[in-house]
Structure formats: structure tokens, C-alpha cells
Amino acid sequence: AILGRSETQECLFFNANWEKDRTNQTGVEPCYGDKDKRRHCFATWKNISGSIEIVKQGCWLDDINCYDRTDCVEKKDSPEVYFCCCEGNMCNEKFSYFPEMEVTQPTSNPVTPKPP
């Protein structure tokens, strides 16, 4: 591992659609990928009338958008489905939303997912 870099070997796994997809609902996912490429964790969720609904969590392949991010933070302004990625084992256990917008608009509070 490169000094100062968190290598991702496993991520929190969650699938809201687990019955239809015939997977576990929750657990720990080992991350696979090309040996020289970086691996990350991700989380996706929806905000339904102020209520946070996790869609999926798991491993994510080498992506410069995720480099050196120890926290899973969505920065896109009001996406349909929120997505964040990070580096480090189980770094997707917590995720938050801090949109990058004009200074006049306040940022949102961090989101702590409700247990399934």
C-alpha cells in the first residue's frame, strides 16, 4: 500500500431490493478488482419527503472521484439518487450530503442512515 493511503478491502453491503435480486440484505462485501487499481466503497440513497431510504451500499471500482476521500459525501445539488464514494474499509457505513452551491444557500446536515 502507498503510505498515507487507505486501501479498501471490504465495504458495508446493503441492498434494499435484496429479495428481487436474490442477495443478502446486509453484510460485509469483499472488494475485487485489478490488482494495480484502487478500490472504493459507495452508498446510494433517496430522500423521500425528508426520510432517508438507503438503496445500495457496496464496493466501487477505481474512480478518481473517490481518491483520498475518507468520508462518503455527496456534493451534487439535489440529485434524484444520492451517491457517494470513499476509500478505506467500511468507509460507507456513514454518508452525508453537502451540496456545492452558492454561498447564500445553507448546506445540509450529515445523514446517518437508519438501521434496516
Epitope: Y32, I64, F83
Partner: antibody, heavy 115, light 111 residues
């Protein structure tokens, strides 16, 4: 092993639409992006757009904005690229590629636009 | 994002070295280590050779190397072989907040 298998060649009339599919196997489809690239006969590669296969979020090249739609069907591990209002200049081989680095490519789909 | 600039063609004899350049701007090539190189033989799909400026893709011979100086990325092929004759494209990472762009391509002829 990772494979991206694309749908077969298409011949289309000007003004119509085409939808090309790209079926992924050998990796977890929802763990990366799918990018779409085209190559006109004797020309270079041209990036069209990308989709995040888990969130469905898309980005398109300005040139194709409003004319291209990229979607992903998680249940079949398949990505789709639909191009509308076709013109003769859209005659090209269309490729899908995995991830932001384009590390695996489909075999290509020739779309011919001719009246 | 405007296309990256590559020479139309380069050539070299077997055993020689050739370098293909890819020039962008300070806001793309100059700012990020996200330039890739692809090899394409006639009638075939492109193949990733180098990613992230200088990282060799798995299975790619170490005769292929990538580097960057300022706003220009370079692909160097040493010990040229007949099978290296192909078109080479530089391109950028695409996904998330990054938009893709390719160079115009360089035809490598092995004399």
C-alpha cells in the same frame, strides 16, 4: 472474465432513432460507470456520455446533449444508448466501455444512417 | 471540453523508440493525472494501455510507458515491434464530475 457484448448492426433512416445495448458480465455491473464512445468511418474516437450504473446518474458530451439518452438496467446488467434525430453523419461504430478508465470495451455496433 | 491534440502520424524502425504526444490545457492534462492511452488495430475495439498518466494496464508489455510534463502527456514505445503498428489515442477519465475527451489519434507505422 469481464465481457461487454453489444447488440448487432443497425440500418436506420434519417430522422429516426437507434437504441444500442451493451450486456456486461464477469464483474458486478453496479460497481462502476459505463461510457459510450463512437467512431465514424476513418475518424477518431468521440466520447458521447457516461452513466453511473448504480445511481443512474448521467453526463453527456455537449455535442449530443438533448439527442442521446443513456440508461442502465441493473436486473439484466445491460446499458443502453439511444440516439435520436439521426442524420447521415451519425453513421459510425458505437462502443460501450467499462469504468472511468475505459478498461474493457464492447466489440462495437455499426449504425448506418441512410435514406 | 475541447479535443486533445496529437500528431497525425509517427514512424520508427523495429527496435527503435517512438514518443507520441498529447497536448491539452492547464485545466485538463495540466491539472490532473487522469490521461489514458489506447491502442486500436484496424477493425478492432480500442484497448487500454496506460491509465492515470503512467500506470500500465495489466498485461501490457513494459515497452509501453507514459509520462507528463506541463500540459503535455506522452506515450513512449521502446523496442518497437511490428505488432505495435496501430492507431493510438489519448483520452481522459470520464465519470462523476469528469467529462471525457479524446485526442484525434496518431497512426504509428513500423517501417
Amino acid at each position: 472474465q469481464v465481457q461487454l457484448v453489444q447488440s448487432g448492426a443497425e440500418v436506420k433512416k434519417p430522422g429516426s432513432s437507434v437504441k444500442v445495448s451493451c450486456k456486461a458480465s464477469g464483474y458486478k455491473f453496479t460497481s462502476s460507470y459505463i461510457n459510450w464512445v463512437r467512431q465514424a468511418p476513418g475518424q477518431g474516437l468521440e466520447w458521447m456520455g457516461t452513466i453511473n450504473a448504480v445511481s443512474g446518474s448521467t453526463s453527456y458530451a455537449q455535442k449530443f446533449q438533448g439527442r442521446v439518452t443513456i440508461t442502465a438496467d441493473e436486473s439484466t446488467s445491460t446499458a443502453y444508448m439511444e440516439l435520436s434525430s439521426l442524420r447521415s453523419e451519425d453513421t459510425a461504430v458505437y462502443y460501450c466501455a467499462r469504468g472511468g478508465w475505459f478498461d474493457y470495451w464492447g466489440q462495437g455496433t455499426l449504425v448506418t444512417v441512410s435514406s | 471540453q475541447s479535443a486533445l491534440t496529437q500528431p497525425r502520424s509517427v514512424s520508427g524502425s523495429p527496435g527503435q523508440s517512438v514518443t507520441i504526444s498529447c497536448t491539452g490545457t492547464s485545466s485538463d492534462v495540466g491539472s490532473y493525472n487522469y490521461v489514458n492511452w489506447y491502442q486500436q488495430h484496424p477493425g478492432k475495439a480500442p484497448k487500454l494501455m496506460i491509465y492515470g498518466v503512467s500506470k500500465r494496464e495489466s498485461g501490457v508489455p513494459d515497452r509501453f510507458s507514459g509520462s507528463k510534463s506541463g500540459n503535455t502527456a506522452s506515450l513512449t514505445i521502446s523496442g518497437l515491434q511490428a505488432e505495435d503498428e496501430a492507431d493510438y489515442y489519448c483520452g481522459t477519465f470520464a465519470g462523476g464530475k469528469y467529462y471525457g475527451v479524446f485526442g484525434g489519434g496518431t497512426k504509428l507505422t513500423v517501417l
